[in-house]
């Protein structure tokens, strides 16, 4: 999906209002320096691409993020503020339902959510006047 035509400010508002708090809850008890941020993004569409990938694509050691509250709210925000996004996700959602697993918060998941926080931070505050 091409995130170029999303309403970035509306997504930012949704993040600051609710999603960020859910990420904090998920990470509670974890030190901010515990993980090194290795994923980065260069602009807002790229940030959303990376956020979608980390939030919804199962990875080795962390298959369960898509069912978390922050993930569901992220999905809702993208569906509302990114034209045509919902349609592209129908097949992915059906596939996900088939492999629903027991929720386990692994260290790998905590690391992944730490990366997500960095991506969201970048998405929210790009330095718009590039020199």
């Amino acid at each position: 999906y091409d995130f170029t035509n999303c309403d970035f400010e509306k997504i930012k508002a949704a993040y600051l209002s609710t999603i960020s708090k859910d990420l904090i809850t998920y990470m509670s008890g974890t030190k901010s320096t515990e993980f090194n941020n290795t994923v980065s993004c260069s602009n807002r569409p790229h940030c959303l691409t990376e956020i979608q990938s980390l939030t919804f694509n199962p990875t080795a050691g962390c298959a369960s993020l898509a069912k978390e509250m922050f993930a569901m709210k992220t999905k809702a925000a993208l569906a509302i503020w990114c034209p045509g996004y919902s349609e592209t996700q129908i097949n992915a959602t059906q596939a996900m339902k088939k492999r629903r697993k027991r929720k386990v918060t692994t260290n790998k998941c905590l690391e992944q959510v730490s990366q997500l926080q960095g991506l969201w931070r970048r998405f929210n505050r790009p330095l718009l006047k590039q020199q």
Partner: antibody, heavy 120, light 111 residues
């Protein structure tokens, strides 16, 4: 502990340049916007610009655009602010500051400040 | 540039009384229903410290006698019951539009 430690006070001649450093520790330096703010004696706060260490992208206050250069050294988690063509009105305390964890845009961690005095 | 104008420039309030500082922006600092206005406190010889973010949210570790309100162009910082340690200069800041700009500051003293 999250902190920013700045270099020491400087006394400079008009027309010269000054380079102030800001060493970060306790957080992943490359993923936070780093800002520079100055405060002339008895005056208010003035934003100079910001840099994103992840890729070196910058944003400058146009007032300073031709005289200020912001850089970072990711290997040492250090941000630098260089101000050229100094004049007496550049006498001020220069602060580096980190943007918050969540992208709200406020400055949650500040350096202790570096006093720069420009005098002939 | 968005110009931030604080009033008054200085304020003297008795201990235990309410202190109110206003900040007016030359144009709206709202975006998508959120107000991108922050308040800082600065004591002599120290860097500023965040008090309120996004107009009305209390910063971490800030006493609840501090509160913020407003939207659009008009914002208010209120200290419900002034304490001796609240003597400082207070600044508003908008971060909705580059360049980021601060108010000129309001000096708060004890009467």
């Amino acid at each position: 502990e999250v902190q920013l430690v700045q270099s020491g006070a400087e006394v400079k001649k008009p027309g010269s340049s000054v380079k102030v450093s800001c060493k970060a520790s306790g957080f992943t330096f490359s993923t936070y916007n780093m800002h520079w703010v100055r405060q002339a004696p008895g005056q208010g706060l003035e934003w100079m610009g910001a840099i994103y260490p992840g890729n070196g992208e910058t944003s400058y206050n146009q007032k300073f655009k031709d005289r200020v250069t912001l850089t970072v050294d990711k290997s040492t988690s250090t941000a630098y602010m260089e101000l050229s063509s100094l004049r007496s009105e550049d006498t001020a305390v220069y602060y580096c500051a980190r943007e918050d964890d969540y992208g709200e845009g406020y400055f949650d961690v500040w350096g202790q400040g570096t006093t720069v005095t420009v005098s002939s | 540039d968005i110009v931030m104008t604080q009033s008054p420039d200085s304020l003297a309030v008795s201990l235990g009384e309410r202190a109110t500082i206003n900040c007016r922006a030359s144009e709206s600092v709202d975006n998508s229903g959120l107000s991108f206005m922050h308040w800082y406190q600065q004591k002599p010889g120290q860097p500023p410290k965040l008090l309120i973010y996004r107009a009305s949210n209390l910063g971490s570790g800030v006493p609840d006698r501090f509160s913020g309100s407003g939207s659009g162009t008009d914002f208010t910082l209120t200290i419900s019951s002034l304490q001796a340690e609240d003597v400082a200069v207070y600044y508003c800041q908008q971060i909705n539009t580059d360049p980021l700009t601060f108010g000129q500051g309001t000096k708060l003293e004890i009467k």
